[in-house]
């Protein structure tokens, strides 16, 4: 990915998305009614000119924004302790990652804007979450909507790093 | 390109234990669920149930609990329909389709070609 | 269960008729409401979901409308293609249940 984001980093983000599974607590079955339209913005990551600054930008705001869903008294509440200690952990990790990568991409003269705008766009979508999670009253169905969303579009972006990669690939070996 | 492919027709005679399967490609498999719908002859569309294959979870519809029985093998990317005594009215058209869960997406957007299962003695 | 009403259970009409089918829900269902139409020999085939989000690749001669228990399936223009059974469905809650259908018959 342009530097040295090591390779385990896809292993973590599937990690993650494993984590993310075995935290189901109910039947998602019992919690059709409470779907939502969270309007996630598909085109910030099916895109097929993709730059590092981009997918490195979208990939840290989305696991920050996880992060912070995550760390907060009532998803304490709502899900177990152990296994949101590892999320924690292995979410930690990857931003870390990603951190060190993003500041290299910034040196390198990439565009402050394929930085920022993803940035603003994800928080308002993470906003929308969060104001359906209180509406809900953070009932054991609305998280578990909120999980099942959570893991479509960490396996969307995951992907989008994916595409890089083999982009990257491709260019290297021609 | 999406795609659920069912197994071919079969005919049985009742007493007789049948499992048809669904098979799915070019999605992520555990990422949806598959839901069974029959046709009788000339019928409408009725829903029987339904599983999601990242754990093999199922819900069934009150009219056909207990009498089929849905499993998936997610390392085959593949859902099946199980009858473990066939009746003359089962005799019917069989569809598996897609569902996206608890995600805000189309309901049912991909079918398979359908397996018809017919009982006579 | 969800019951669904659909009205006509058939109709007849020609080729460029504005055609209407109607779907009533026993219950509040906000907009999960899905339209499907089948024809002989056929699986069926997505048109219309969650109300009136017409789904990819369906001509924009149909349309959908509706929320809560009453919802509405509009043919703008009939073409040849378009003769065929049309069901609804709700996603609301289990058991999904579906309309009886609506056979739409060539006058």
């Known amino acids: 990915l342009g530097c040295d984001l090591p390779q385990n980093h896809g292993l973590l983000s599937r990690n993650t998305l494993v984590l993310l599974h075995q935290m189901r607590r109910i039947s998602p079955f019992l919690c059709l009614k409470d779907r939502r339209d969270f309007r996630f913005p598909q085109e910030m990551v099916k895109g097929s000119q993709l730059q590092k600054a981009h997918v490195m930008s979208v990939l840290h705001e989305m696991l920050q924004q996880i992060f912070s869903l995550f760390h907060t008294e009532r998803s304490s509440a709502a899900w177990n302790m152990t296994l949101l200690d590892q999320l924690h952990t292995g979410l930690h990790q990857q931003l870390q990652h990603l951190e060190t990568c993003l500041l290299q991409v910034v040196g390198e003269g990439e565009s402050a804007g394929a930085i920022s705008s993803p940035a603003l766009t994800l928080r308002r979508y993470f906003q929308g979450i969060r104001v359906y999670l209180k509406e809900k009253k953070y009932s054991d169905c609305a998280w578990e909507v909120v999980r099942m969303e959570i893991m479509k579009s960490l396996f969307l972006s995951t992907n989008m790093q994916e595409r890089l990669r083999s982009k990257d690939r491709d260019l290297g070996s021609s | 390109e999406v795609q659920l492919v069912q197994s071919g027709a079969e005919v049985k005679k009742p007493g007789e234990s049948l499992k048809i399967s669904c098979k799915g490609s070019?999605?992520?498999?555990?990422?949806?669920?598959i839901g069974w719908v029959r046709q009788m002859p000339g019928k409408g569309l009725e829903w029987m149930g339904i599983i999601d294959p990242s754990d093999s979870d199922t819900a069934y519809s009150p009219s056909f609990q207990g009498q089929v029985t849905i499993s998936a093998d997610k390392s085959i990317s593949t859902a099946y329909l199980q009858w473990s005594s066939l009746k003359a009215s089962d005799t019917a058209m069989y569809y598996c389709a897609r569902h996206p869960g608890l995600n805000w997406a189309p309901d049912f957007d991909y079918w398979g070609q359908g397996t018809l299962v017919t009982v006579s003695s | 269960d969800i019951q669904m009403t659909q009205s006509p259970s058939s109709l007849s009409a020609s080729v460029g008729d504005r055609v209407t089918i109607t779907c009533r829900a026993s219950?509040?269902?906000?907009?999960?409401l899905n339209w499907y139409q089948q024809k002989p020999g056929k699986a069926p085939k997505l048109l219309i979901y969650?109300?009136?989000s017409l789904q990819s690749g369906v001509p924009s001669r149909f349309s959908g409308s509706g929320s809560g228990t009453d919802f509405t399936l509009t043919i703008s223009s009939l073409q040849p293609e378009d003769f065929a059974t049309y069901y609804c469905?709700?996603?609301?809650?289990?058991?999904?249940?579906f309309g009886q259908g609506t056979k739409v018959e060539i006058k």
């Open positions: 469905q709700q996603s609301y809650d289990f058991p999904l249940t």
């Open positions: 070019g999605y992520s498999f555990t990422s949806y669920w």
């Open positions: 219950q509040s269902i906000g907009k999960s």
């Open positions: 969650f109300a009136s």
